[in-house]
Interface confidence: medium
């Protein structure tokens, strides 16, 4: 039975050219996290963090994506095209698979603030 909950940074905004941290946190379960996948809105994989193999950043994103902090992901040199949904997928044992959603809005404005408040989707 899946008892866990994915908490995410929810809806966040950041300014063009800047960076942003995407974070998901799995709580309320004793399940072991075997792998975390990070995907973009069009289902393309950005990065994978395997418990035993470590991080794999996909070639198309290697210049703009940094692993961490923790199981999170840092997007750098943001462009307007980065606006959209991001998903974290937690493969766990023995629970199965959990999925969280984050919406990132990239703003032209220099006053864009990065919100890091965790939300339950």
């Amino acid at each position: 039975m899946m008892t866990g909950t994915i908490e995410t940074t929810g809806n966040i905004s950041a300014k063009k050219g800047g960076s942003v941290i995407l974070q998901c946190h799995l709580s309320s379960t004793m399940a072991q996290v075997t792998q975390v996948n990070w995907e973009q809105h069009d289902h393309s994989l950005l990065a994978i963090r395997n418990a035993e193999l470590g991080w794999h950043i996909y070639p198309a994103f290697k210049d703009r994506v940094a692993p961490g902090p923790g199981l999170g992901l840092t997007l750098q040199s943001l462009t307007m095209n980065d606006t959209g949904e991001y998903f974290c997928t937690y493969h766990t044992y023995p629970d199965g698979t959990y999925r969280g959603r984050i919406f990132l809005e990239v703003l032209e404005s220099s006053v864009a603030e990065h919100s890091a408040r965790f939300q339950i989707p």
Epitope: H43, I48, E52, T97
Partner: antibody, heavy 119, light 107 residues
Framework: EVQLVESGGDLVKPGGSLKLSCAAS????????MSWVRQTPDKRLEWVAI????????YYPDSVKGRFTISRDNAKNTLYLQMSSLKSEDTAMYYC????????????WGQGTSVTVSS | DIQMTQSPASLSVSVGETVTITCRAS??????LAWYQQKQGKSPQLLVY???NLADGAPSRFSGSRSGTQYSLKINSLQSEDFGSYYC?????????FGGGTKLEIK
């Protein structure tokens, strides 16, 4: 060249036990997750077990949970499947397979070993 | 457990034709799907993983696509060596079930 060679298949009575082995060569065995998959006489494929590269994580479907145990010896480049309390529905060709890095899909398969459970 | 409904169960086609095989998942599996080919008396071989990624060594006439919970394997300009059985498999949750298979036969 990647090679996976299964052995240990046999005719066994219901309730009996059997241990299958899979000898791996041609790749760094300790870097890959591994799986056992079986193919029933009616040609259906059934996933049986998965073990992570270091052996810390294992997954089983409900149909074999508590009866089958997957394990590995990275020093010997060998994958195992210990099967107990065997049932007639466990009759199948058993394949060991290597998983793609960071994905659960299986990119190399052995030739299979046959297990028949019958009285 | 997630069920994978594969269709058609069998298909009789001619060399040079284009074929599409589909698998429908009983719930969202978010592109966590693979396609395999199995020839008579042989082990399965990986064709596509993560729904759309062509496996190393798989011919470019094979392609995978997704529309919601329906996944498709397309074979362009069918070759004689493409005849055999095809299976999908999902990797979501904890029970990674296969579709029932599609047997591709020469017309």
């Amino acid at each position: 060249e990647v090679q996976l060679v299964e052995s240990g298949g046999d005719l066994v009575k219901p309730g009996g036990s059997l241990k299958l082995s899979c000898a791996a060569s041609g790749f760094t065995f300790s870097s890959y997750g591994m799986s056992w998959v079986r193919q029933t006489p009616d040609k259906r494929l059934e996933w049986v077990a998965i073990i992570s590269s270091g052996g810390n994580y294992t997954y089983y479907p409900d149909s074999v949970k508590g009866r089958f145990t997957i394990s590995r010896d990275n020093a010997k480049n060998t994958l195992y499947l210990q099967m107990s309390s065997l049932k007639s529905e466990d009759t199948a060709m058993y394949y060991c397979a290597r998983q793609i890095h960071y994905f659960f899909a299986m990119d190399y398969w052995g030739q299979g070993t046959s297990v028949t459970v019958s009285s | 457990d997630i069920q994978m409904t594969q269709s058609p169960a069998s298909l009789s086609v001619s060399v040079g034709e284009t074929v599409t095989i589909t698998c429908r998942a009983s719930e969202n599996i978010y592109s966590n799907l693979a396609w395999y080919q199995q020839k008579q008396g042989k082990s399965p071989q990986l064709l596509v993983y993560a729904a759309t990624n062509l496996a190393d060594g798989a011919p470019s006439r094979f392609s995978g696509s997704r529309s919601g919970t329906q996944y498709s394997l397309k074979i362009n300009s069918l070759q004689s060596e493409d005849f055999g059985s095809y299976y999908c498999q999902h990797f979501w949750g904890t029970a990674y079930t296969f579709g029932g298979g599609t047997k591709l036969e020469i017309k």
